[in-house]
Interface confidence: low
Amino acid sequence: QGGTRSPRCDCAGDFHKKIGLFCCRGCPAGHYLKAPCTEPCGNSTCLVCPQDTFLAWENHHNSECARCQACDEQASQVALENCSAVADTRCGCKPGWFVECQVSQCVSSSPFYCQPCLDCGALHRHTRLLCSRRDTDCGTCLPGFYEHGDGCVSCPTSTLGSCPERCAAVCGWRQ
């Protein structure tokens, strides 16, 4: 037995860790550590996270729960999922809005704000994507409109003058 680097937990089960000086059973998700066990392999005293706080994982050391995040109204965020004892609030954007990341390398925890999706219909274009962010995300001009410069222009209803190709059904010669 010589040369053992240090003692290890030898309690039954796999949810014991050293808390202070003893091997203690930890607290389940949604609970915080009120007091550790007072004998080897004993149960810790665990209490449920108070309202508006949470702990997402089983734990042995958290003596207080984390405060639930508030969605940033200034950034037009809304709560997609409310906070529970075991999970933080999940913030996102309401329907018709998209997430615009505030940093270049965007990950799930990056700060963000919500931008309204482009209304392709108001631009007289087909809606090609669920949420268009730029004019170029929209489709071709709606029937009755034709491409002119960067936008869609209403087809002339008069048969006098030029009739753009896409407007033939509106202003072309009727056979």
């Epitope: 037995q1 680097r5 240090s6 003692p7 290890r8 937990c9 030898d10 014991h16 860790k17 050293k18 808390i19 202070g20 000086l21 003893f22 091997c23 007091a35 550790p36 066990c37 007072t38 004998e39 080897p40 050391h61 003596s63």
Partner: antibody, heavy 121, light 115 residues
């Protein structure tokens, strides 16, 4: 090689303050709980204070609670003991002692060489 | 607080053997203790932890001459083939938790003299 080197001891008058330091090397400092243990001349060992690896759990012996403060700086591999309002009975050799990093049963598996604190008027 | 009791002294002949006792207060008879060796003017050194069932785990560099055993509230440290470097004071210690406070308590130590 695991090493714990205490410093900061010396002669102090009652009511004064001292800060002890323990510099660690040869192991992952931030993984380990740490303790201060003292030994008065010709006497046995007396536990003084405990701090967990991330400073989340701290505990003191009744004889020093309210006067001594244990702290650590994991970035600098250092443990500290701030000793205020010193008394003559605090005269002792002060050791820092490491707790094993692994979960489970306890031990103070490595000790420093100690630093002498003498409180006398 | 837990109480650990040790006899103050013991002697052993060179190459002989010696058995040291650490007695726990009765309500702690199933607890684990730790043995430490402290040579004169040196820091304590971790020898082993010792459980109530007698199983133990030794620290780095502790020779096979050192062994541990248990019986009820008694924890024993046995040294066989005693060498001059075993001349030291041996402390038993135990960690405890009380009202969310952590601590260590130590026995008064047994001074082993090698004759």
């Amino acid at each position: 090689e695991v090493q714990l080197v205490e410093s900061g001891g010396g002669l102090s008058q009652p009511g004064n303050s001292l800060q002890l330091s323990c510099e660690a090397s040869g192991f992952t400092f931030s993984n380990h709980d740490l303790n201060w243990v003292r030994q008065a001349p010709g006497k046995g060992l007396e536990w003084v204070a405990y701090i967990s690896s991330a400073s989340g759990l701290i505990s003191y012996a009744d004889a020093v609670r309210g006067r001594f403060t244990i702290s650590r700086d994991n970035a600098k591999n250092s443990l500290f003991l701030q000793m205020n309002n010193l008394k003559s009975e605090d005269t002792a050799m002060y050791y820092c002692a490491r707790d094993p990093a692994y979960t489970g049963l306890y031990a103070l598996d490595f000790w420093g060489q100690g630093t002498q604190v003498t409180v006398s008027s | 607080q837990p109480v650990l009791t040790q006899s103050p002294s013991a002697s052993a002949s060179l190459s002989g053997s010696v058995k040291l006792t650490c007695t726990l207060s009765s309500e702690l008879s199933n607890y684990t203790i730790v043995w430490y060796q402290q040579r004169p003017d040196k820091a304590p050194k971790y020898v082993m932890y010792l459980k109530s069932d007698g199983s133990h785990s030794k620290g780095d560099g502790i020779p096979d001459r050192f062994s541990g055993s248990s019986s009820g509230a008694h924890r024993y440290l046995s040294i066989s083939n005693v060498q001059s470097e075993d001349d030291a004071t041996y402390f038993c210690g135990m960690g405890y938790t009380l009202a969310n406070q952590y601590g260590w308590v130590f026995g008064s130590g047994t001074k082993v003299t090698v004759l």
